[in-house]
């Protein structure tokens, strides 16, 4: 990790070893209000690799609801709406951080967890042409 | 939030009000080892809406490094390698949770923060606005 200069106004912490337990304020600060996020809400339908969104709910996790993308087709969609067998729809995946209640059912104790989620789909060429 | 039955083995917490401060173990549990995540590492190059990945670093944030996708073209790439301007490359965005050091520089005190990141790009049909 990166060495951070200790600020004298910081809350005290006794355990300096990993696994380290830290204090986290759950009053979420949303940085996105200052930006103008692209409205990607309808891309799932308009994409040449369209996807459906499936709700994944787990009360032991924070956030408890995560939306998972599942590509609708194995191939990509042509302008006429039919499948292009020469191209593939594939999920774009990202590792995200979530908080997992630990011990289970405890409202104020969590462990950080990395999970892999599919965010949407993109259309790719199946074969990489190697140039000699 | 969801009402969770209190487990007698839970760490004690005095503040039951929001903004609530919780204990978080930073020893990350990686759920992905049990799955076989699709190897999406080269999709950014093989997509009809290819993207570049830009490193966004912030030592006051956990994780400190986040990769941001930027679509390479406004249009999508055809089989012959040329750009089709009748289609649009657009970023697929996702809100993710990060931990922000608060107060600044404190190693053991954080606030949850939501940020919007572009994960990759997809090729969409543009919305055509018909004039009456």
């Amino acid at each position: 990790g990166i060495a951070i200069p200790r600020n004298s106004g910081c809350p005290n912490s006794e355990d300096k070893n990993f696994p380290r337990t830290v204090m986290v304020n759950l009053n979420i600060h949303n940085r996105n209000t200052s930006t103008n996020p692209k409205r990607s809400s309808d891309y799932y339908n308009r994409s040449t690799s369209p996807w459906n969104l499936h709700r994944n709910e787990d009360p032991e996790r924070y956030p408890s609801v995560i939306w998972e993308a599942k590509c609708r087709h194995l191939g990509c969609v042509k302008a006429d709406g039919n499948v292009d067998y020469h191209m593939n729809s594939v999920p774009i995946q990202q590792e995200i951080l979530v908080l997992r209640r630990e011990p289970r059912h405890c409202p104020n104790s969590f462990r950080l967890e990395k999970i892999l989620v599919s965010v949407g789909c993109t259309c790719v060429t199946p074969i990489v042409h190697h140039v000699a | 939030g969801i009402a969770i039955p209190r487990n007698s083995g839970c760490p004690n917490s005095e503040d039951k009000n929001f903004p609530r401060t919780v204990m978080v173990n930073l020893n990350i549990h990686n759920r992905n080892t049990s799955t076989n995540p699709k190897r999406s590492s080269d999709y950014y190059n093989r997509s009809t809406s290819p993207w570049n990945l830009h490193r966004n670093e912030d030592p006051e944030r956990y994780p400190s490094v986040i990769w941001e996708a930027k679509c390479r073209h406004l249009g999508c790439v055809k089989a012959d390698g040329n750009v089709d301007y009748h289609m649009n490359s657009v970023p697929i965005q996702q809100e993710i949770l990060v931990l922000r050091r608060e107060p600044r520089h404190c190693p053991n005190s954080f606030r949850l923060e939501k940020i919007l990141v572009s994960v990759g790009c997809t090729c969409v049909t543009p919305i055509v606005h018909h004039v009456a």
């Epitope: 087709h73 194995l74 191939g75 042509k78 006429d80 709406g81 039919n82 499948v83 292009d84 067998y85 020469h86 593939n88 594939v90 199946p126 074969i127 990489v128 | 076989n36 699709k38 190897r39």
Partner: antibody, heavy 120, light 107 residues
């Protein structure tokens, strides 16, 4: 019960034509991708043609491209394979097969097959 | 075209044995792999799709695994009705191609 029944096979001379049919029942034919797959005597499986649910997309491997045509009549729940300029190496059992999705990628139901023999 | 190489081409085993059949693609097929069972004079029967998803009605003694170029079909405890020829098929890149088959015979 899903059923696929092929017909139209037989003995034909090289250079001649043959048309295979596959009658489908027990499922909504118009929503599934279909394919023809062949198997030469004592050999493995080879893809011959793919068609999507509405006939708007097709694919042929190089071995049959320009000679074979896959088509479907959703009103008759029937899949076809028109085979022209037949060669000895086209001798095989021809199966029609259904994809569990719209398009024709892998196959969850197969017919019993019809034997095509190309011989002079 | 993507070449699918199955091994072994044939094997002899006894009822109750654990049997493993492998399929290697000439390039990464991103888990787009199906396994079929074929008995003499019959059409193939789909066992597994997506490299690991067992079709409904297929006994749980069958399982698929693997990623990238290398995939495996495992029969945990061979039964008399499992003696047949097994084929893998990739559906990542057209034309979809099949392995040469593995014949499982009674020892």
């Amino acid at each position: 019960e899903v059923q696929l029944v092929e017909s139209g096979g037989g003995v034909v001379q090289p250079g001649r034509s043959l048309r295979l049919s596959c009658a489908a029942s027990g499922f909504t034919f118009s929503t599934y991708g279909m394919s023809w797959v062949r198997q030469a005597p004592g050999k493995g499986l080879e893809l011959v043609a793919i068609i999507n649910h509405n006939g708007g997309s097709t694919f042929y491997p190089d071995s049959v491209k320009g000679r074979f045509t896959i088509s479907r009549d959703n009103s008759k729940n029937t899949l076809y394979l028109q085979m022209n300029s037949l060669r000895a190496e086209d001798t095989a059992v021809y199966y029609c097969a259904r994809d569990p999705r719209h398009d024709g990628y892998f196959f969850d139901y197969w017919g019993q097959g019809t034997l095509v023999t190309v011989s002079s | 075209d993507i070449q699918m190489t199955q091994s072994p081409s044939s094997l002899s085993a006894s009822v109750g044995d654990r049997v493993t059949i492998t399929c290697r693609a000439s390039e990464d097929i991103y888990d787009r792999l199906a396994w079929y069972q074929q008995k003499p004079g019959k059409a193939p029967n789909l066992l597994v799709s997506g490299a690991t998803s067992l079709e409904s009605g297929v006994p749980s003694r069958f399982s698929g695994s693997g990623s990238g170029k290398d995939y495996t079909l495992t029969i945990s405890s061979l039964q008399p009705e499992d003696f047949a020829t097994y084929y893998c098929q990739q559906y990542w890149s057209v034309p979809w191609t099949f392995g040469g088959g593995t014949k499982v015979e009674i020892k």
